[in-house]
């Protein structure tokens, strides 16, 4: 059977270039290790933005230089990325594989559309 | 560019053992998994083994379990497949393969040549 | 374990005709996670569509994928010369990852 993966369609990212959204995943087994991969699609071509692999019950850990940060409760795990700008506007994909134990499964998402607006400069002041 | 370069191939008697190479290029190698595939003569294509990003696990096909050992050098940029007990029926070409981000085998190796035969 | 049975075993067919190829599966696949590749003799396999019906960098229009569930197609629009291969679908979406026997175009 292949793993559904459920992700908001669309997401508006803040002035500050911060996008959250819910990846969640329907698991056809019990998973104790799961990789979780954010993927941007742009013109046909994907590009890895971040991933974590955690162990079930713990804490999502994206290495110290990541954009993305995250937690996990169950099958669903929260995303955040920062520091986005205009130019960063597209698909974003999220990517579920059990790794542990067997059987592995792959799910992917049908993508998060992320729009990114610059904030407008402040004016000058006199 | 992407290249996937197998080694180790070559003759060997039933019952010996043989590794194999693959040598990676042109790509962050931790950050992709990785299979063996093999294709005996005049027949399709029979996925072997797969290898998680840091090796840590391992899925093998029924018909090569307990036998074979797949690993990874992330350091090296390299994969390995130990044969250990081969058969007659393990005659085949290696093909080594990139899991792509979405799932397929996105990038092969041109593959070695195993012939087990006494 | 997730079997491949594709159909059929050999197509002959003349270099501008329309190949339909079929890959059907023992129980679902999600369509993210079939691909169908090509192999010409003495080479490697060559990735073609994946996702059911997304095709690979590089690859020509012509070629075309459908299908959902169970039931799944290969198309070629209009055989070109180097299009002659044998081609297999592929399921990737868990362990096993597993193959069909291939189907093999051949010049009529």
């Known amino acids: 059977k292949a793993m559904h993966v459920a992700q908001p369609a669309v997401v508006l990212a803040s002035s500050r270039g911060i996008a959250s959204f819910v990846c969640e995943y329907a698991s056809p087994g019990k998973a104790t290790e799961v990789r979780v991969t954010v993927l941007r699609q742009a013109d046909s071509q994907v590009t890895e933005v971040c991933a974590a692999t955690y162990m079930m019950g713990n804490e999502l850990t994206f290495l110290d230089d990541s954009i993305c940060t995250g937690t996990s409760s169950g099958n669903q795990v929260n995303l955040t990325i920062q520091g986005l700008r205009a130019m960063d506007t597209g698909l974003y994909i999220c990517k579920v594989e059990l790794m542990y134990p067997p059987p592995y499964y792959l799910g992917i998402g049908n993508g998060t559309q992320i729009y990114v607006i610059d904030p407008e400069p402040c004016p000058d002041s006199d | 560019q992407v290249q996937l370069v197998e080694s180790g191939g070559g003759v060997v008697q039933p019952g010996r053992s043989l590794r194999l190479s693959c040598a990676a290029s042109g790509f962050t190698f931790s950050s992709y998994t990785m299979h063996w595939v093999r294709q005996a003569p005049g027949k399709g294509l029979e996925w072997v083994t797969f290898i998680s990003y840091d090796g840590n696990n391992k899925y093998y096909a029924d018909s090569v379990k307990g036998r074979f050992t797949i690993s990874r050098d992330n350091s090296k940029n390299t994969l390995y497949l130990e044969m250990n007990d081969l058969g007659t029926e393990d005659t085949a070409i290696y093909y080594c393969?990139?899991?792509?981000?979405?799932?397929?085998?996105?990038?092969w190796g041109q593959g070695t040549l195993v012939t087990v035969s006494s | 374990e997730i079997v491949l049975t594709q159909s059929p075993g050999t197509l002959s067919l003349s270099p501008g005709e329309r190949a339909t190829l079929s890959c059907r599966a023992s129980q679902s696949v999600g369509s993210s996670y079939l691909a169908w590749y090509q192999q010409k003799p003495g080479q490697a396999p060559r990735l073609l569509i994946y996702g059911a019906f997304s095709r690979a960098t590089g690859i020509p229009d012509r070629f075309s994928g459908s299908g959902s569930g169970t039931d799944f197609t290969l198309t070629i629009s209009r055989l070109e010369p180097e299009d002659f291969a044998v081609y297999y679908c592929q399921q990737y979406g868990s362990s096993p990852w597993t193959f069909g026997q291939g189907t093999k175009v051949e010049i009529k």
């Open positions: 393969a990139r899991t792509g981000w979405l799932g397929p085998f996105d990038y």
